[in-house]
Interface confidence: medium
């Protein structure tokens, strides 16, 4: 099995984790995709997923998590807004491909959320107030109930993540594999 690596992000409460998961375009464009958290000793837990089949550039919101699948570019954008300390954990993106095991994307992301903003109070909110407005047409999707542990047989692509500060609500905890996007405050 290939050893999974983690990439660590250190963010403040109230900021946004904005990550992108790259996938093989032709193979997975319309596949259902999910954002998962992995806690020590537990199976991966799915926090949010796209519709089935996944729709192009159509935001799906589950609490404080927003997923957007960009088929033309082969990437899933994941945002966790208004981060809380309890959101700290290990995350990952996966592609559902029943009846096979979910296909994991990229290196895992270790998210560390600490209390309080750095710098001037409120500066992050101000600087990103116009950044992560959640579209009014977001959809909630039903996710498959199963999450099974998997043996990684190939090195996953690398990931990308981003940070910002919007105002929305999400319920999360730990997660495993994801890709990161840059952070804008």
């Amino acid at each position: 099995a290939t050893k999974l690596t983690e990439e660590k992000y250190e963010l403040k409460e109230g900021q946004t984790l904005d990550v992108k998961c790259d996938y093989t375009l032709e193979k997975f464009a319309s596949s259902q995709k999910a954002w998962q958290i992995i806690r020590d000793g537990e199976m991966p837990k799915t926090l949010a997923c796209t519709e089935r089949p996944s729709k192009n550039s159509h935001p799906v919101q589950v609490g404080r998590i927003i997923l957007e699948d960009y088929h033309d570019h082969g990437l899933l954008r994941v945002r966790m807004v208004n981060l809380q300390v309890e959101d700290s954990g290990l995350y990952q993106c996966v592609i559902y491909q029943p009846p096979k095991e979910p296909h994991m994307l990229f290196d895992r992301i270790r998210l560390v959320v600490t209390k309080g903003f750095s710098g001037t109070p409120g500066s992050n909110e101000n600087s990103t107030q116009n950044v992560y407005k959640i579209p009014p047409t977001t959809t909630k999707a039903l996710c498959p109930l199963y999450t099974s542990p998997r043996t990684v047989t190939q090195a996953p692509p690398k990931s990308t993540a981003d940070v910002s500060t919007p105002d929305s609500e999400i319920n999360l905890t730990n997660v495993t594999d994801i890709i990161r996007v840059p952070v804008f405050n």
């Epitope: 990439e7 660590k8 992000y9 250190e10 963010l11 403040k12 900021q15 992108k20 790259d22 960009y70 570019h73 082969g74 990437l75 954008r77 990229f106 290196d107 560390v112 600490t114 750095s118 600087s127 990103t128 116009n130 950044v131 992560y132 692509p157 690398k158 990931s159 990308t160 993540a161 981003d162 940070v163 910002s164 890709i179 990161r180 996007v181 840059p182 952070v183 804008f184 405050n185």
Partner: antibody, heavy 125, light 107 residues
Framework: QVQLVQSGAEVKRPGSSVKVSCKAS????????ISWVRQAPGQGLEWMGG????????NYAQQFQDRVTITADESTRTAYMELNSLKSEDTAVYYC??????????????????WGQGTTVTVSS | DIQMTQSPTSLSASVGDRVTITCRAS??????LAWYQHKPGKAPKSLIY???SLQSGVPSRFSGSGSGTDFTLTISSLQPEDFATYYC?????????FGQGTKLEIK
Amino acid sequence: QVQLVQSGAEVKRPGSSVKVSCKASGGTFSIYVISWVRQAPGQGLEWMGGIIPLFGTPNYAQQFQDRVTITADESTRTAYMELNSLKSEDTAVYYCARGHGPGSSHYSYYGLDVWGQGTTVTVSS
Amino acid sequence: DIQMTQSPTSLSASVGDRVTITCRASQGISSWLAWYQHKPGKAPKSLIYAASSLQSGVPSRFSGSGSGTDFTLTISSLQPEDFATYYCQQYNSYPYTFGQGTKLEIK
């Protein structure tokens, strides 16, 4: 080989606006961060803001939040930075720079790896 | 915002010298730090990314280390073309912030 080509030098009056363009040739444009960085005479580098063209949502440094607008046009592979209410202190060289995108662990995993040649903006009455 | 503090702000050295520049972040940034070289009239050049990875085409005399809040750029044996201003930049979170720069001059 990705290249970023910026528009030419500008001379502006205080209170006016300037719009600098940054055209990408070669490689992928849409899913990279295009950042804008400036350097005033005798000063250091200052990150103004950036945009991922595909997502279209700009991010700004706090000190420029009220005066700068960063946009991108995917069809022409061009990013723009418009700075309003110009002051003499805005006299600087303005650079666009690309942060890495797909297949990396972070949109800017490689830092700002490709830079434009710079655009000199002079604000003077 | 995350503040980046470089030291020293200026440094005089001779060809062949080993030079170290440090950069400190006001909060943890994991390894999301880059180093740039900037010469007058030219665009900045990326040297190091992810704190310690050498950008393609950059001579191996440049190296970076550190994680969390403390980072170092080392030039093992100064060459004439290395005299320039060096900047660190964090990209753990927006706004991406630069250090104030370290000007490396010929002694």
